[in-house]
Interface confidence: low
């Protein structure tokens, strides 16, 4: 029986050219997390495997940084980055949990409070 729940950053917005942190957390279960996949629509962005660590998709390696934690940092945002992002937790013995985040990337003049930072 799957008892866990995923908390996410929900619907977020950021400035074009800026950066954003996507974070999810799996709670209310004792299941072991074996791998977390980060996907944008149907594209695989990154994998964090419990044994093998992080793997960033080569097509995103210049703009995606692992962390913090099991989260993902998107840098040098473009308007084309707008859309749904999914954190997919593969667990044992529960199975798969999925969290959804919607990111809207705004033109600089529109996003008055966009995040302006870089992950070292």
């Amino acid at each position: 029986m799957m008892t866990g729940t995923i908390e996410t950053t929900g619907n977020i917005s950021a400035e074009k050219g800026g950066s954003i942190i996507l974070q999810c957390h799996l709670s209310s279960t004792t299941a072991q997390v074996t791998q977390v996949n980060w996907e944008q629509q149907d594209q695989l962005l990154a994998i964090c495997n419990a044994d093998l660590g992080w793997h960033i998709s080569p097509s995103f390696k210049d703009r995606v940084a692992p962390g913090p934690g099991l989260g993902l940092t998107l840098q040098s945002l473009t308007v084309n980055d707008t859309g749904e992002y999914f954190c997919i937790y593969h667990t044992y013995p529960d199975g798969t949990y999925t969290g959804r985040i919607f990111l809207e990337v705004l033109e600089s003049s529109v996003a008055e409070h966009g995040a302006r930072f870089q992950i070292p």
Epitope: A14, I21, H25
Partner: nanobody
Amino acid sequence: EVQLVESGGGLVQPGGSLRLSCAASGFAFSSDWMGWFRQAPGKEREWVASVLRGGYTWYADSVKGRFTISADNSKNTAYLQMNSLKPEDTAVYYCARGEGFDYWGQGTLVTVSS
């Protein structure tokens, strides 16, 4: 109106400790994300730590094991306990309201020097 006010910065010797506070108002503190960032002179602002409702925490590798982020919902305040400080921790420290970290405080200066 969302307001974030940092305090607790100052001059400390290497190896010393400081506790930064971020008093928040104008939003549902207990249901949001909070983060600490820092900006050293001439450098980009960088993420330090963040905390999710429920107390889940994340840290940059450079501060892991030395810094602790926490939040007191009853006081609408977030904290950053900084131990074993190093000269390279010298920076202006900012707290930010979570989700897209879309609101920022004015910052508090931390100087680590002998």
